[in-house]
Amino acid sequence: SHMAPTHQLPPSDVRKIILELQPLSRGLLEDYQKKETGVPESNRTLLLCLTSDSQPPRLNSSAILPYFRAIRPLSDKNIIDKIIEQLDKLKFQHEPETEISVPADTFECKSFILTILQQFSACLESVFKSLNSGPQ
């Protein structure tokens, strides 16, 4: 196949994917904040979105994907599907995905979703900065 295995993409292609993800993530977060005003960020949810074993940091797609699969029925499915599609391209092929359960309480659930979206946006910003600060 012409395409390199998805977990073997060079920094240039990773950067392309991050550039696609940024407006999707930003738009999803802004829409959710408008729709769910007054919902606080949860201090019980931590999205481990960066790998600790690579320099510069790599987006830990396998850790992020389960969260987006979990919140998909409760958010903008169309945008979430686009985000999942991009994250799949960055996933190491044989990395297992953990099962994530969304809080049953409505308010806690909204707080959980908001936290995921906020942390993901911050994470993309961090990875993008690291890709731009390389020896360019």
Epitope: M3, A4, Q8, L9, P10, P11, S12, D13, K89, P135
Partner: antibody, heavy 118, light 111 residues
Framework: EVQLQESGPSLVKPSQTLSLTCSVT????????WNWIRKFPGNKLEYMGY???????DYNPSLKSRISITRDTSKNQYYLQLNSVTTEDTATYYC????????????WGQGTSVTVSS | DIVLTQSPASLAVSLGQRATISCRAS??????????MHWYQQKSGQSPKLLIY???NLESGIPARFGGSGSRTDFTLTIDPVEADDVATYYC?????????FGGGTKLEIK
Amino acid sequence: EVQLQESGPSLVKPSQTLSLTCSVTGDSITSGYWNWIRKFPGNKLEYMGYISYSGITDYNPSLKSRISITRDTSKNQYYLQLNSVTTEDTATYYCARYGNYGYAMDYWGQGTSVTVSS
Amino acid sequence: DIVLTQSPASLAVSLGQRATISCRASESVDTYGNSFMHWYQQKSGQSPKLLIYRASNLESGIPARFGGSGSRTDFTLTIDPVEADDVATYYCQQSYEDPWTFGGGTKLEIK
């Protein structure tokens, strides 16, 4: 078969804007990445930037303040605008497709020669 | 930016002989065992044509006389045997890091 065709003025005056069109047939610009590359008279090739399937753009930092790539999906065309041109922008301009991650630019237009001169 | 240095700048080879073109990158263009270096052929008055992608993969429709090898910073394009139709300028290009960059080109002539 995928075909790309550049068009636009062959002569541009210094300080003006260079505007080129790339017309694509045999593939949709709503998939893949669509690039501009130029070749200077001394044969040096320079990568300029791209517009993606979703409309995201990214440019060579050496041109960032002067370049803009846009598209019209209904016409299956994408465009290059280069502002404040100088004689140093005299080159043959190519459009090319980058179809798959981890691959290379597999289809190129035939190129259009642009001279910047008063 | 990653600088690609091609050598020689020009090359004259007899028909049926082997042509070898070198491309050296200022830093590694490898990730997880893949080399993001590609080779193009540009004939006079034509656009560049992809020959080899990811260092050693022959593009569809390209004759097996063309071959690519190398990894990290050192890459080679080989044409064996050279035919009259191979007269052109050959360029290497890296897609490892932004901005993508090209080598200065090697002009192949027939002796």
